[in-house]
């Protein structure tokens, strides 16, 4: 009788993560009598995957009934495959020995490759906000995919970006891989509503790439422009001075009125109006009782936006142009938001 051969007909098997791998093995003879064992890897460090004789292997099932005496099919199924299961599996026939069974013949091995989907890309931007015309960096990370081949693209509002660098790790063989990419984006004043998108394409995704997004609203700071103007009011001793705070983002803003350098009133932007581009406008006004002033008044609108150094705009109020009201020596002012007069 010809000597027993162990046949593993599949050189390689490709399985998607989460699925079941079938590793085929048959023997050409029942003799010599002895068990079959499955190992991952070869040599002294090989890992036991299944032992026909003893042990508990909850993820492994046999294709045929191995306790049947005439059985020569030693194929196994391994359930719930993960990238960590990748490797070369050997079906090994042992002959009975004492004190231990003795390895008799090994199959040629079956390489199990695991296709694993990349994790959802996570896009993160800079820790601090930046202003238009500045270049900021965004990173995109995705993990746990196999095989190594992967494509990553960056978009800003649907337009593909070209200024980015991508690394796939590790460089050598591994059960699974990670991708890390950094893109540079130049901010513009119109970017409050903009989105940066990282798109990852992989063989496991069947043409339906994964996307991660970052809103530039979390990255950009658009500093306000200030304009101070003066309008006359019906009462001839009063002047309405308006500070227009335009095109700022984010909303966090504090405004202080100064009369000749002295703080007159401080208020926080509340009832703002939003522009189409996502920036905000706000207006504050000051009702000045001109008769309370002997000399010209320098009115300053000072704005502190999003914790940044204050910016200001001044307006010189010419007192000489207004007749003074006798006996009055205090300036009247009101809050810009509800036009209440305070005397």
């Amino acid at each position: 009788e010809e000597e027993l051969q162990v046949i593993q007909p599949d050189k390689s098997v490709l399985v998607a993560a989460g699925e079941t791998a079938t590793l085929r093995c048959t023997a050409t003879s029942l003799i010599p009598v002895g068990p079959i064992q499955w190992f991952r890897g070869a040599g002294p460090g090989r890992e036991l995957i299944y032992n026909q004789k003893e042990g508990h292997f909850p993820r492994v099932t046999t294709v045929s009934e191995l306790t049947k005496r005439e059985n020569m099919d030693f194929s196994i199924r391994i359930g719930n495959i993960t990238p960590a299961d990748a490797g070369t599996y050997y079906c090994v026939k042992f002959r009975k020995g004492s004190p231990d069974d003795v390895e008799f013949k090994s199959g040629a091995g079956t390489e199990l490759s695991v296709r694993a989907k990349p994790s959802a890309p996570v896009v993160s931007g800079p820790a601090a906000r930046a202003t238009p015309q500045h270049t900021v960096s965004f990173t995109c990370e995705s993990h746990g995919f196999s095989p190594r081949d992967i494509t990553l693209k960056w978009f800003k509002n649907g337009n593909e970006l070209s200024d980015f660098q991508t690394n796939v790790d590790p460089v050598g063989e591994s059960v699974s891989y990670s991708i890390h990419s950094t893109a540079k984006v130049v901010l513009t004043r119109e970017d409050v509503h903009s989105q940066v998108i990282c798109e990852v394409a992989h063989v496991t995704l069947q043409g339906d790439p994964l996307r991660g997004t970052a809103n530039l609203s979390e990255t950009i700071r658009v500093p306000p422009t200030l304009e101070v103007t003066q309008q006359p009011v019906r009462a001839e001793n009063q002047v309405n001075v308006t500070c227009q705070v335009r095109k700022f983002y984010p909303q966090r803003l504090q405004l202080t009125w100064l009369e000749n350098g002295n703080v007159s009133r401080t208020e926080t932007a509340s009832t703002v109006t939003e522009n189409k581009d996502g920036t905000y406008n706000w207006m504050s006004w000051l009702l000045v009782n001109v008769s309370a002033h002997r000399d010209d008044v320098k009115l300053t609108c000072q704005v502190e936006h999003d914790g940044q150094p204050a910016v200001s705009k001044s307006h010189d109020l010419k007192v000489s142009a207004h007749p003074k009201e006798q006996g009055s020596n205090t300036a009247a002012e009101n809050t810009g938001s509800n036009e209440r007069n305070i005397y």
Partner: antibody, heavy 120, light 107 residues
């Protein structure tokens, strides 16, 4: 046909040795192990030991260690069991059997048995 | 060593009866248990291997079950030729051990 043919009955004196043969035919002798089992009159079955016909490795019952030797001759497909320093309680029918399990031990083919009587 | 305890040691039954013999191992032996039938003056004959597999040529009225430590041999409908002594045997590891036997006698 597939069979195990054992040597004939033996009468031995205490302290003597006995060598029982078991000739296999009809199958590949080296593909299977051979076990020896004995049965004293009116008693149950007692496993004596095992030998690999492929490589000659052995495993003996503790109580017989040092008194028993199992060998094979692959050229004649024959297994032998020698028991030394015989005592009266060694009187039994000695069976050889083919050990056929793949990852376990069971015996699917038996010889007819050899009666060994130890008597002074 | 693994001890094998068989019960009952004897049973009286009639042709057509259902007969059940049990065997308990002193420690877990997976499914590595065999059952033998022995008639007076004859060698044992393998009936069941690996706890539940019927040996080739053995009538289907014989069946085996169990795993771990507790095993059963069942003869579904006793026939005249079934009156004999039955032995269980653990085949998990050396030393191989047999149960004490169960004698099935005619009632």
């Amino acid at each position: 046909q597939v069979q195990l043919v054992q040597s004939g009955a033996e009468v031995k004196k205490p302290g003597a040795s006995v060598k029982v043969s078991c000739k296999a035919s009809g199958y590949t002798f080296t593909g299977y192990g051979i076990v020896w089992v004995r049965q004293a009159p009116g008693q149950g079955l007692e496993w004596m030991g095992w030998i690999s016909a492929y490589a000659g490795e052995t495993n003996y019952a503790q109580k017989l260690q040092g008194r028993v030797t199992m060998t094979t001759d692959t050229s004649t497909s024959t297994a032998y069991m020698e028991l030394r320093s015989l005592r009266s309680d060694d009187t039994a029918v000695y069976y050889c059997a083919r050990e056929a399990g793949s990852s376990w031990y069971d015996f699917d083919l038996w010889g007819r048995g050899t009666l060994v009587t130890v008597s002074s | 060593d693994i001890q094998m305890t068989q019960s009952p040691s004897s049973v009286s039954a009639s042709v057509g009866d259902r007969v059940t013999i049990t065997c308990r191992a002193s420690q877990g032996i997976s499914s590595w248990l065999a059952w033998y039938q022995q008639k007076p003056g004859k060698a044992p004959k393998l009936l069941i291997y690996a706890a539940s597999n019927l040996q080739s040529g053995v009538p289907s009225r014989f069946s085996g079950s169990g795993s771990g430590t507790d095993f059963t041999l069942t003869i579904s409908s006793l026939q005249p030729e079934d009156f004999a002594t039955y032995y269980c045997q653990q085949g998990a590891s050396f030393p191989i051990t047999f149960g004490g036997g169960t004698k099935v006698e005619i009632k």
